[in-house]
């Protein structure tokens, strides 16, 4: 907390300028208006301020607006972003995606903080759901951020916001999470045709349920094994032996590379030997 | 609901077998939806693995164990069981059997037997 | 062998605290990671399958996430009955492997 004292004669300022950088940090607190800050918030992020005179700068908005900035601040706060406190943040309410583009920007390279994840869900929650646009924000700062919402909140994806997914953004999610992002996706492509279908799907189909297995084994898709790899377990292991060849069509040789792992291993655990043979892979139920 | 139980010797002389079953109770060994394990656990240490096997007979050991390790069915008792050769005293610990459901992991575990490899 | 290693191997935590314990795997074991919790003297108890599915019975306060090689388990609001041993344990190759061990003690 600065103290309270008059600001020395002539020193008043009348716009937010460099010559602010020589102000000691009881200098600022006396003679920056704080009206005048926050109108002029867009320059401070071009006079290299220390810390502890934007920690004066921070108060002076605070006691101007202690129920939460107004977006108009908040959109040009920039470096002054990373002073703030997840609590700050809850009390503001950001709604324009320019906005949330400004203050990503300022973090970007870095981890999500705490910060950053409290503005995304304070926007997210004001728009209602995760549309398009900015699904195609978030995931452009941060690959995993799909993965990092819960089975719960990405419900809230309409399947309209499917086709802003890429295959990275899907690396890190679990089953729990792909079962809720598979039926949005297949609705989302539902109308393209077979092979650009797949293509589409394929990132999403950790979440596939045993029927469409099977349909897409008749559609000579020829999955890669790193696919297969990622399908739910309960799904693959109904499949039978002439399903899965045809599924993989010639990438079906590389179930002998992967034969010790899941789900390859449990699905072969369940095979008659003679069909298993059939395969001449040398796979052993 | 399925229950696990172990039973055979506490007490092993070093360089000789032991031997464990595990009888099912409630469920069946023959479920194509689990693999049947064994654990051990030394005392004041870790949890590891020994192995499976499914009712079809097939089996998987800890490679670190597999000379030594034979594991076996018999579902017609509903049981499985353990050998474990050339015993040494650093094999004493509490041997637990465990069912492998293939959608989770270990559920249901027996409540442990304790084995000791002493002269 | 795919070696499984846990982070910390204790900690001392008091009722109502949030707990994070971490399990990396040597290579990549998908979402096939399981956490089993211990007390003395009795058999584990699994609590969270496939990384982050809680199973049927255990309270909600658990959860675990992560994918690939690094995993979590998180206990919201640490109960007097959560004081134990956690085990993290990779069912993705078939030498099932454990993690060494967390054990949560009272602070």
């Known amino acids: 907390e600065v103290e309270k004292t008059a600001c020395p004669s002539g020193k008043k300022a009348r716009e937010i300028d460099e010559s602010l950088i020589f102000y000691k940090k009881w200098e600022l607190e006396a003679c920056v208006d704080a009206a005048l800050l926050a109108t002029q918030m867009d320059r401070v992020n071009a006079i290299p301020f220390t810390y502890e005179q934007l920690d004066v700068l921070k108060h002076k908005l605070d006691e101007l607006y202690p129920q939460g900035y107004p977006e108009s601040v908040i959109q040009h706060l920039g470096y002054l972003f990373l002073k703030m406190s997840p609590e700050d943040i809850r009390k503001w309410n950001v709604t324009s995606l320019e906005t949330l583009k400004a203050l990503l920007e300022v973090n970007k390279g870095h981890e999500m903080s705490p910060q950053v994840a409290t503005l995304i869900d304070r926007f997210v929650k004001g728009r209602g759901q995760l549309d398009k646009d900015t699904l195609d924000t978030l995931t452009a700062f941060y690959p995993g951020y799909l993965c990092s919402l819960s089975p719960e909140e990405l419900s809230s994806v309409p399947p309209s916001s499917i086709w802003a997914v890429r295959p990275q953004d899907l690396d890190t999610c679990d089953p729990r999470q792909l079962d809720v992002l598979y039926p949005k996706a297949r609705l989302a492509f539902q109308n393209m045709n077979g092979s650009e279908y797949f293509v589409k799907i394929q990132s999403f189909l950790g979440g596939a349920p045993t029927e469409d297995l099977k349909a897409l084994s008749q559609q000579n898709v020829s999955m890669d094994l790193a696919t297969f790899m990622k399908l739910r377990t309960d799904a693959v292991l109904p499949l039978t032996v002439a399903e899965v060849q045809k599924l993989l069509g010639p990438h079906v040789e590389g179930l002998k590379a992967e034969e010790r792992h899941r789900p390859v291993r449990d699905w072969i655990l369940r095979q008659r030997q003679d069909d298993l043979d059939t395969l001449g892979l040398g796979l052993q139920g | 609901q399925v229950q696990l139980q172990e039973s055979g010797p506490g007490l092993v002389k070093p360089s000789e077998t032991l031997s464990l079953t595990c009888t099912v109770s409630?469920?069946?060994?023959?479920?194509?939806?689990?693999?049947w394990s064994w654990i051990r656990q030394p005392p004041g240490k870790g949890l590891e693995w020994i192995g499976y096997?499914?009712?079809?007979?097939?089996?998987n050991y800890n490679p670190s164990l597999k000379s030594r390790v034979t594991i076996s069915v018999d579902t017609s008792k509903n049981q499985f069981s353990l050998k474990l050769s050339s015993v040494t005293a650093a094999d004493t610990a509490v041997y637990y059997c465990?069912?492998?459901?293939?959608?989770?992991?270990?559920?249901?575990w027996g409540q442990g037997t304790m084995v000791t490899v002493s002269s | 062998d795919i070696q499984m290693t846990q982070s910390p191997s204790s900690l001392s935590a008091s009722v109502g605290d949030r707990v994070t314990i971490t399990c990396r795997a040597s290579?990549?074991?998908?979402?096939?990671l399981n956490w089993y919790q211990q007390k003395p003297g009795k058999a584990p108890k699994l609590l969270i399958y496939?990384?982050?599915s809680l199973q049927s019975g255990v309270p909600s306060r658990f959860s675990g996430s992560g994918s690939g090689t690094d995993f979590t388990l998180t206990i919201s609001s640490l109960q007097p009955e959560d004081f134990a041993t956690y085990y993290c344990?990779?069912?993705?190759?078939?030498?099932?492997?454990f993690g060494g061990g967390t054990k949560v003690e009272i602070k």
């Open positions: 465990a069912r492998d459901f293939v959608l989770s992991g270990f559920d249901i």
């Open positions: 344990q990779q069912s993705y190759d078939a030498s099932y492997t």
């Open positions: 409630g469920g069946s060994v023959s479920s194509r939806d689990d693999l």
């Open positions: 496939a990384a982050s």
């Open positions: 290579q990549s074991i998908s979402s096939y």
């Open positions: 096997i499914y009712y079809s007979g097939s089996t």
